[in-house]
């Protein structure tokens, strides 16, 4: 906190300009009018203030706006945004996407900070849902943003926003998140034809149920092994050898290299060895011929 002292004669700031870098902290406190600062915030970015000087400027704005800054000031905070705490940001009401972009730009190239996370949270809550333009903006700055949301938060994403999602945006999503996103993607892309639909839906297939995988196997999609390995194990297990062969097309040969990894390993254990042999890949571990397979889950459901 800077002590309250009178401004020396002739030092009263008439505008926010570079001469202020020569002011000591107490002079900035005494000689810069907070209302002037608020109206000329856009100039602060062009002046190489020290971090200590920025602290003083922030303090002046805090005094002027104890209930939180207006959006007209927030939009022009520039690197002063980095001085804000999550508590400061919780007082803000940010409604403009332009303001959001301006502040995300300040943090560009860095990990998502607590300040940015709070800002995004405030913005999205204010909008009521994660619309396409917002999602576009957020994933442009933070490709992993979508996967940082809880399944509950993802449920507020409208299907129309899914068009903004790129494959790399889903790289760190876990199966619970894909379970929420997949039905939205299915709805969003439902009017596309077979091959185009598969290109779009592919990144979301980690949330697909068995019946959708069976349907895809009838469409000559030639799913690659990387996508297959990300499928839900419980969705893959009921697929027959013929269905997996159709689903993977020429990529079926890749199963051999993955036979010790899930979901391939678990799927092999559920197949008849005879059927696996038809693939000619030397996959081992299937159910030997003559064994009876009891589906205990079906038995439990009936009792």
């Amino acid at each position: 906190e800077v002590e309250k002292t009178a401004c020396p004669s002739g030092k009263k700031a008439r505008e926010i300009d570079e001469s202020l870098i020569f002011y000591k902290k107490w002079e900035l406190e005494a000689c810069v009018d907070a209302a002037l600062l608020a109206t000329q915030m856009d100039r602060v970015n062009a002046i190489p203030f020290t971090y200590e000087q920025l602290d003083v400027l922030k303090h002046k704005l805090d005094e002027l706006y104890p209930q939180g800054y207006p959006e007209s000031v927030i939009q022009h905070l520039g690197y002063l945004f980095l001085k804000m705490s999550p508590e400061d940001i919780r007082k803000w009401n940010v409604t403009s996407l332009e303001t959001l972009k301006a502040l995300l730009e300040v943090n560009k190239g860095h990990e998502m900070s607590p300040q940015v996370a709070t800002l995004i949270d405030r913005f999205v809550k204010g909008r009521g849902q994660l619309d396409k333009d917002t999602l576009d903006t957020l994933t442009a700055f933070y490709p992993g943003y979508l996967c940082s949301l809880s399944p509950e938060e993802l449920s507020s994403v409208p299907p129309s926003s899914i068009w903004a999602v790129r494959p790399q945006d889903l790289d760190t999503c876990d199966p619970r998140q894909l379970d929420v996103l997949y039905p939205k993607a299915r709805l969003a892309f439902q009017n596309m034809n077979g091959s185009e639909y598969f290109v779009k839906i592919q990144s979301f297939l980690g949330g697909a149920p068995t019946e959708d995988l069976k349907a895809l196997s009838q469409q000559n999609v030639s799913m690659d092994l990387a996508t297959f390995m990300k499928l839900r194990t419980d969705a893959v297990l009921p697929l027959t050898v013929a269905e997996v062969q159709k689903l993977l097309g020429p990529h079926v040969e890749g199963l051999k290299a993955e036979e010790r990894h899930r979901p391939v390993r678990d799927w092999i254990l559920r197949q008849r060895q005879d059927d696996l042999d038809t693939l000619g890949l030397g996959l081992q571990g299937g159910i030997p011929n003559g064994y009876l397979v009891l589906d205990l889950s079906m038995q439990e459901a009936l009792s």
Epitope: E18, D42, R43, N45, A46, I47, P48, F49, T50, H76, G78, Y79, F81, A102, E105, V106, K108
Partner: nanobody, 119 residues
């Protein structure tokens, strides 16, 4: 790596001269206003000199006016501080800072170079 590196500091006698350099790597200095600052032991960091991104505008702290000159060579991605008639009170760590201006919120600080004025 994006950084500012200062050089040119050292030990000099009162009345002597030094030329400090602030070189940018990893980004182009053309678009940045530059400030030179100094910090003496136990004192607040203070602004010494300023030059606009175009080089058309310069400014100085009262304590160095007429003795220090700031300039820039954008082709060399470097800003200079020519310090003449040095006094013991000019002693300190000198560092440069770059500010990008509206629409460019990047700013950079160098680690500093030490200047000692003593007989």
């Amino acid at each position: 790596e994006v950084q500012l590196v200062e050089s040119g500091g050292g030990l000099v006698q009162p009345g002597g001269s030094l030329r400090l350099s602030c070189a940018a790597s990893g980004f182009t200095l053309d678009y940045y206003a530059i400030g030179w600052f100094r910090q003496a032991p136990g004192k607040e960091r203070e602004g010494v000199s300023y030059i606009s991104s175009s080089g058309g505008s310069t400014n100085y702290a009262d304590s160095v006016k007429g003795r220090f000159t700031i300039s820039r060579d954008n082709a060399k991605n470097t800003v200079y501080l020519q310090m003449n008639s040095l006094k013991p009170e000019d002693t300190g760590v000198y560092s440069c800072a770059a500010a990008g201006g509206y629409g460019n919120s990047s700013r950079y600080w160098g680690q500093g170079t030490s200047v000692t004025v003593s007989s």
